[in-house]
């Protein structure tokens, strides 16, 4: 794969993870009641990060925010703080990663600016996913800690109760933006690695270019270096050569079409 | 304004079917559930089941399971409740009612009163 | 199933008097997700459809008189009608409208004394 593609590539697939955080971040079925093994009931309850929500079998939905800061867990601000500083993570990683793609021409940028704002972008894909990844395995394991505890108040609880009046309680499952926020972390972390794998290709290599002349026992002897590279430290010539090799197109070549990675 | 308006009395033999129809107006007939109630001559009301005209899913008490079927037309805006296996003490006004907030019935028909008598 | 219990099953009150109707259900009928109790009233009078009154234990249907009050919240529930008039003499039912099947309490029949 080209520089360019898998640049572009890392870009599509950052921006597709970003856009699922934020659409996790924002959906309200985080937990939705479970309806295995309970009583049936009409009413349809379920939970995000920023309201409750009670969807009636008449088809009548009212959502209630958490308007309150301090009555609120720990655990659900610190979840909400990890999907918020992913997004922002994100938004910026996205911001650098436009500048750095090396189908756009922005002035004199030359490609040791553009590698370096490359890696700069997938490492904040990378922290942004690790973040949304986070959040969503924390909420899960606190879901499965209340409903563990709920199931225990369910059987341990009826006894004392005349058998005659029983309070029914709602248990919570995993709702669909858990999974939502699982993949599009995922997504965001690989995006992030693509991107600093296009760094590599990226990265300018003089000696892979110039021709250095040596002057030894009066004869002019022109040789390329091959295994040698220790400035940047990416291995073999061979295998630079093969990540810059786009066929019979130059690099430049790519640059006058720009439309066919113009990912913007 | 919301109507339903249910098909007229009906005599029945002991073993047979009924069929109740329930045509509503005045509303988008596929986004609310009709729920169908029976009351038996002096005595309390019992619901039976409903459907969701927009999907077709129904909910039945388990009590009439196996010999009520709830359906419903959206072309012609009609729910249907069909009890089979007709029994003496199936002698009812079958009332549908159109669902409102908090799962309640607030939209009635104005009852159809179904004899099962040999 | 859910039980409903009414009481008194009937009950006769005076013109302009205060009639109060009690009704109990097996389970609670709140649902912590909006901390609303789905108990429903309504009013039956002789071969008509029952009336919606109140629904949510508490909120009065439109265009229902303000003498008509619902309150109580799990198990409990009142229907009070704070001043009797001559059109309010019916069967009146409390109805679970939480958990199917829904159910209805066996109603309380309104008299004037």
């Known amino acids: 794969m080209s520089v360019t593609a898998c640049q572009g590539l890392g870009f599509v697939v950052s921006l597709i993870g970003f856009a699922g955080i934020i659409a996790a971040t924002c959906m309200d079925q985080w937990s939705t009641q479970d309806l295995y093994n309970n009583p049936v009931t009409a009413v349809f309850n379920y939970q995000g990060l920023w309201r409750s929500c009670v969807r009636e079998s008449s088809g009548f939905t009212e959502c209630r925010g958490y308007f309150t800061l301090l009555g609120l867990p720990a655990m659900l601000q610190a979840v909400r703080a990890l999907m918020i500083v992913g997004i922002v993570l994100g938004v910026i990683g996205i911001l650098v990663s436009i500048f750095a793609l090396k189908c756009i021409r922005i002035g004199s940028m030359d490609d040791s600016a553009k590698a370096k704002m490359t890696l700069t972008s997938g490492i904040l894909f990378i922290i942004s996913g690790i973040c949304a990844i986070i959040g969503v395995s924390v909420f899960a394991n606190m879901l499965v800690t209340n409903f563990w505890m709920s199931t225990a108040n369910m059987y341990s609880g009826m006894g004392g109760m005349g058998g005659m009046v029983q309070t029914v309680q709602t248990r919570y499952t995993f709702g669909a933006a858990l999974f939502v926020g699982w993949v599009a972390g995922g997504l965001t972390l690989i995006g992030g690695v693509m991107m600093c794998i296009a760094c590599r290709g990226l990265t300018p290599d003089d000696s892979n270019f110039k021709a250095v002349s040596y002057h030894a026992s009066g004869q002019n002897v022109a040789y390329r270096p091959g295994g040698f590279k220790a400035s940047t430290g990416f291995g073999s010539n061979t295998r630079n050569k093969k990540i810059y090799d786009g066929g019979a197109r130059t690099e430049d070549d790519e640059q006058s079409h720009p439309t066919k990675y113009d990912y913007v | 304004q919301v109507q339903l308006v249910q098909s007229g009395a009906e005599v029945k033999k002991p073993g047979s079917s009924v069929k109740v129809s329930c045509k509503a107006s005045?509303?988008?007939?596929?986004?609310?559930?009709i729920e169908w109630v029976r009351q038996a001559p002096g005595q309390g009301l019992e619901w039976m089941g409903l459907?969701?005209?927009?999907?077709?899913?129904?909910n039945y008490n388990e009590k009439f399971k196996g010999r009520v079927t709830i359906t419903a037309d959206e072309s012609t805006s009609t729910a249907y409740m069909e009890l089979s296996s007709l029994r003496s003490e199936d002698t009812a006004v079958y009332y549908c009612?159109?669902?409102?907030?908090?799962?309640?019935?607030?939209?009635w028909g104005q009852g159809t009163l179904v004899t099962v008598s040999s | 199933d859910i039980v409903m219990t009414q009481s008194p099953d009937s009950l006769a009150v005076s013109l302009g008097e205060r009639a109060t109707i009690n009704c109990k259900s097996s389970?609670?009928?709140?649902?912590?997700?909006?901390?609303?109790?789905?108990l429903a009233w309504y009013q039956q009078k002789p071969g008509q459809p029952p009336k919606l009154l109140i629904y949510?234990?508490?909120t009065r249907e439109s265009g229902v008189p303000d003498r008509f009050s619902g309150s109580g919240s799990g198990t409990d529930f009142t229907l009070t009608i704070s001043s009797l008039q001559a059109e309010d003499v019916a069967v009146y039912y409390c109805?679970?409208?939480?958990?199917?099947?829904?159910?209805f309490g066996q109603g309380t029949k309104l008299e004037i004394k």
């Open positions: 009612a159109r669902v409102y907030y908090g799962n309640t019935f607030a939209y």
């Open positions: 389970q609670s009928l709140l649902n912590t997700g909006n901390n609303k109790n789905y």
């Open positions: 109805q679970n409208d939480y958990f199917y099947p829904f159910t």
């Open positions: 459907i969701n005209p927009g999907s077709g899913g129904t």
């Open positions: 005045g509303y988008a007939f596929s986004n609310y559930l």
């Open positions: 949510w234990a508490s």
